[in-house]
Interface confidence: medium
Amino acid sequence: QDEDFKASDDLTSISPEKRFKVSISGTEVVVTCPDVFGYDNIKWEKNDNLVEGASNRELSQKEFSEVDDSGYYACYADSIKEKSYLYLRARVCANCIEVN
Amino acid sequence: FKVSVEELEDRVFLSCNTSVLRIEGTMGIQLPHSRTLDLGKRILDPRGIYRCNATEEQSDKAPYMQVYYRMCQNCVELNSATLA
């Protein structure tokens, strides 16, 4: 059976430590770098540009803008060449909650 | 070998020079020529992990791309009336 447009096989999930964590509360968005890079001297890029002053596993944006702050994020450790990428697009609002 | 994310009209598409591999998350629809995965409407908050198909020797050059949409379709504004 060949692959078709409207179907796809379930593939093995990657281990949780390789995933970014995205937390959104009000207008604040916090992106956490995957565990695989450890805790020391993390570098962040946004749309291939180095984010100055960001060296923690968490990258926090207090007033996230969907237009200006959505895009490609990457984090990596100096000791590990491999980068992890996240494409994030988020719409935020100050006084709202998300209901399922 | 990096997955690129494109938005056209109201939909989200992932593209590679080779083909897009879904690791987990939103299934998507494989479009002709296998280079593009249609993740559907962005208001449905597609999320998942994807990478470009590569040979074993080149797999280290094909990083994972996590996709995270949160379009707040189910967001409820809290004002004094809502809280009352």
Epitope: D2, F5, K6 | E9, F13, S15, L31, H33, S34
Partner: antibody
Framework: ELTLQESGPGLVKPSQTLSLTCGVS?????????WNWVRQRPGRGLEWMGY?????NYNPAFQGRISITADTAKNQFSLQLRSMTTEDTAVYFC?????????????WGQGTLVTVSS | SYVLTQLPSKNVTLKQPAHITCGGD??????VHWYQQKLGQAPVLIIY???SRPTGIPERFSGANSGNTATLTISGALAEDEADYYC???????????FGEGTQLTVLR
């Protein structure tokens, strides 16, 4: 408005190579679209032959004797079909295929009849 | 490789509905395009992705696709709809476009 125009010989001898060109005006031959050749033998249906999009992809039925190239400077793409037989007598169409999100043949040439005969 | 089956010919009375079918193994899992080709002319796209109609194509043309059959429907056939109709899918296994053999529609006055 994009227009495609096939050109080439109307008559080819058996065992010879067919060379057809599709000139494009009102748009550019680039890698962002798929540039296809389709043929239709007399009284028969449409048969996809292959495309160029920077790289090429051919119908396995023609594999080994087909070549599609493009000259982006001249805004044209070409078909070469080797070892022609009378079975290759057909109307040959060039067609542009749209890219994401649609992928269908939106513009066609009017077709050129190629007869294989000695 | 993937095979699409169409009836060679179909007759329809003027202003009556016409249903042109295209059969294929689990075709409902694929996306189907339909082309109209009038005598001596190049094909024209009339339905894409099963049921979408390009700009300029009359509303009487519609499409559906499920199971092993895709269907092109002309709600009320006109004389100008007399043509050959071809279905098309992408065969992801062979990495090739596949056309049906075509159905010749005749509109009876």
């Amino acid at each position: 408005e994009l227009t495609l125009q096939e050109s080439g010989p109307g008559l080819v001898k058996p065992s010879q190579t067919l060379s057809l060109t599709c000139g494009v005006s009102g748009g550019s031959v680039t890698r962002s679209h798929y540039w296809n050749w389709v043929r239709q033998r007399p009284g028969r249906g449409l048969e996809w032959m292959g495309y160029w999009t920077g790289s090429t992809n051919y119908n396995p039925a023609f594999q080994g004797r087909i070549s599609i190239t493009a000259d982006t400077a001249k805004n044209q793409f070409s078909l070469q079909l080797r070892s022609m037989t009378t079975e290759d007598t057909a109307v040959y169409f060039c067609a542009r295929e749209t890219t994401i999100p649609t992928f269908f043949f939106d513009y066609w040439g009017q077709g050129t009849l190629v007869t294989v005969s000695s | 490789s993937y095979v699409l089956t169409q009836l060679p010919s179909k007759n329809v009375t003027l202003k009556q509905p016409a249903h042109i079918t295209c059969g294929g193994d689990n075709i409902g899992s694929k996306s189907v395009h339909w082309y109209q080709q009038k005598l001596g002319q190049a094909p024209v796209l009339i339905i894409y992705y099963d049921s979408s109609r390009p700009t300029g194509i009359p509303e009487r043309f519609s499409g559906a696709n499920s199971g092993n059959t895709a269907t092109l429907t002309i709600s009320g056939a006109l004389a100008e709809d007399e043509a050959d109709y071809y279905c098309q899918v992408w065969d992801s296994g062979a990495k090739a476009w596949v056309f049906g053999e075509g159905t010749q529609l005749t509109v009876l006055r």
